[in-house]
């Protein structure tokens, strides 16, 4: 974990450009900046969110421009813009730098903002090393920022990545974890009595030689007793393979206001009280005007200092400043062995073959509980499933209404009509039945069998 | 999942006026920055403008203040960008582009920060 931080130190006309002034607008204005960090340097970086992480400044001081006035040094916002970053600093990085100017007018919905430059700069930088100070130039305006990245202990490398601990501490966190990753010496020690044990002793003081806990003698070389490690502490030996518990991410709680501080592999987390947000909850008197909500989340309350804000955080977040992804497919919410994915818009089901729906829950090889509508039936068969669906309608679940008529169904140019409950064909004279496929005889009789009782040639005839 | 499509776009005189539209289908976008962002032949895709997400307000790429407005019709899930003074130096194929972030403050002038984006419309200023 560490910090990026930017030092903005002028923002102005460049060399031959335009002598105007960044305050000129209409009305009261004040200037601020933005900063993006995305990790590498590679043309994909490009195409990358602010992986880093990214910053807003404090407002500059309001700025009136006078008329025939020339301008002034510009009054920019204090302080540093600072990133924190929770991993490893990736030592190459796009540093992209927003300078805007809000318009304090009396515009139509409140203040606007203009987007005065936009630079990029792409960098190698090692975390801890000094300022490297720079000037770029966008268009006639050139800004002028130095910027470096720290560690925040206990992390220390130029990646932020090896855990630091003064020399006279302890070697382990709680319960004897490996000390593989942890530095001795992040300190320059001080110069200990001659031939005192580097690994089993220690100074504080030139000329000193302290014993860490289970080893004794001037030089710390006599193991205080031969039992292995029985309880939480023991001598620190190479040989039994123990050591004495030191300092873990969360020892001494770095989080603070009220923070709870939990381990996270190699580093640490803190959970804010309301009202406090930052890497370790430093930061504070936050009202919504400062927009402590991340992700799109609705902040409520907070109109000063001394009243807290409630985050509404939208699907997909928590966190008391939404900053907190939830896994959602923990919850394991696609049925039948979907695969989940967060799209962090949105979740999606993959489904398995033969399942569909937004949470994989149709079978589509099973008509159980599958509904077929107007009064269709559904068939299985094959492996599959289909709808045998009522006269009048169609297509997969017999959601489409037919047209019963378009294949003709009357014969002998029998007429057709669509009726509720199926067709109905009114036969030519000289025709009867359903379809008008029966010739009447000249004595009246049909070609039926037996006619249904107090049915005439040329009525109308319901097909069923 | 948020669909954008842009519209408005054509030939025009310079000096002239164009009113582009896009809308949002998918879901409602009143809590989404929509901006606006162009690009010429051979050049990057450059930010012009459009709302934020955190409360609606205006931002404007410094070299089309005074000349381009920018308003949402949150009803109508649309956005608009009404073009007046155009110049040659204009013409670009517009895209309309939406998110969430950032939560505060002016919409990022980034395009790598907008998950959303439409097909975009041609936009050309004749002299």
């Known amino acids: 974990a560490g910090v990026f931080e930017l030092q903005i130190h002028s923002f102005g006309p460049g060399p031959g450009g335009a002598p105007r002034s960044p305050y000129s607008a209409r009305g009261p204005c004040r200037l601020f900046f933005r900063v993006c960090l995305k990790p590498g340097l590679s043309e994909e970086a490009a195409e990358s969110p602010c992986a880093l992480g990214a910053a807003l400044s404090a407002r500059g001081p309001v700025y009136t421009e006078q008329p025939e006035a020339p301008a002034p040094d510009l009054p920019l916002p204090n302080g540093l813009l600072q990133v924190p970053f929770r991993d490893a600093w990736p030592g190459t990085f796009s540093l992209i730098i927003e300078t805007w100017r809000e318009e304090l007018g009396d515009q139509i919905g409140g203040p606007a903002w203009s987007l005065l430059a936009r630079v990029t700069r792409r960098r190698r930088l090692a975390a801890g090393g000094p300022w490297a100070g720079d000037i770029q130039r966008a268009g006639a305006w050139e800004l002028r920022f130095s910027y470096r990245a720290r560690c925040e202990l206990p992390a220390v490398g130029t990646a932020c990545t090896r855990l630091c601990r003064p020399r006279s501490a302890s070697r382990c966190g709680p319960g004897l974890r490996p000390c593989a990753p942890l530095e001795d010496e992040c300190e320059a020690p001080p110069v200990c009595r001659a031939g005192c044990s580097l690994e089993h002793g220690f100074c504080e003081q030139p000329g000193e030689c302290r014993c860490l806990e289970g080893w004794t003698g001037p030089l710390c070389m006599v193991p205080v007793s031969t039992s292995s490690c029985l309880g939480l502490r023991g001598p620190s030996s190479t040989t039994t393979g123990c050591l004495v518990p030191g300092p873990g991410p969360c020892d001494g709680n770095p989080c603070a206001n009220g923070g709870s501080c939990s381990e996270t592999p190699g580093s640490f987390e803190c959970t804010c009280p309301r009202g406090f947000y930052g890497l370790r909850c430093e930061v504070s008197g936050v009202t919504c005007a400062d927009g402590p909500c991340f992700n799109g989340g609705l902040c409520v309350g907070g109109a000063d200092p001394d009243s807290a804000y409630i985050c509404h955080c939208p699907p997909g977040f928590q966190g008391s400043n939404c900053e907190k992804r939830v896994d959602r497919c923990s919850l394991q919410p696609c049925r039948n062995g979907g695969l989940c994915l967060d799209l962090g818009h949105a979740l999606r089901c993959r489904c398995r073959a033969g399942f569909a729906g937004p949470r994989c829950e149709h079978d589509l090889n099973d008509c159980a509980g599958r509904a077929c509508a107007n009064g269709g039936t559904c068939v299985e068969g094959g492996g599959a499933h289909r709808c045998s669906c009522a006269l009048g309608f169609g297509g997969r679940d017999c959601r489409e209404r037919a047209d019963p008529c378009a294949a003709r169904p009357c014969a002998h140019g029998g007429r057709c009509y669509a009726h509720f409950s199926g067709l109905v064909c009114a036969c030519a004279p000289g025709y009867m039945g359903a379809r008008c496929e029966f010739p009447v005889h000249p004595d009246g009789v049909s070609a039926l069998p037996a006619a249904p009782p107090g049915l005439r040639p040329g009525d109308p005839q319901r097909y069923p | 999942q948020v669909q954008l499509v842009e519209s408005g776009g054509g030939l025009v005189q310079a000096g002239g006026s164009l009113r582009l539209s896009c809308a949002a289908s998918g879901r409602t976008t009143s809590r989404y920055s929509m901006v606006w962002f162009r690009q010429a032949p051979g050049q990057e895709r450059e930010f012009v403008g459009g709302n934020s997400a955190h409360d609606g307000r205006s931002a404007y790429a410094d070299s089309v203040k005074g000349r381009f407005t920018f308003s949402r019709d949150n009803a109508k899930n649309t956005g608009y960008l009404q073009m007046s003074s155009l110049r040659p130096d204009d013409t670009a194929v517009y895209y309309c582009?939406?998110?969430?972030?950032?939560?505060?403050?002016?919409?990022?002038?980034?395009?790598?920060?907008?998950?959303?984006w439409g097909h975009g419309t041609q936009v050309t200023v004749s002299s």
């Open positions: 582009a939406a998110d969430t972030n950032p939560p505060y403050g002016p919409p990022w002038s980034t395009p790598s920060e907008y998950e959303y």
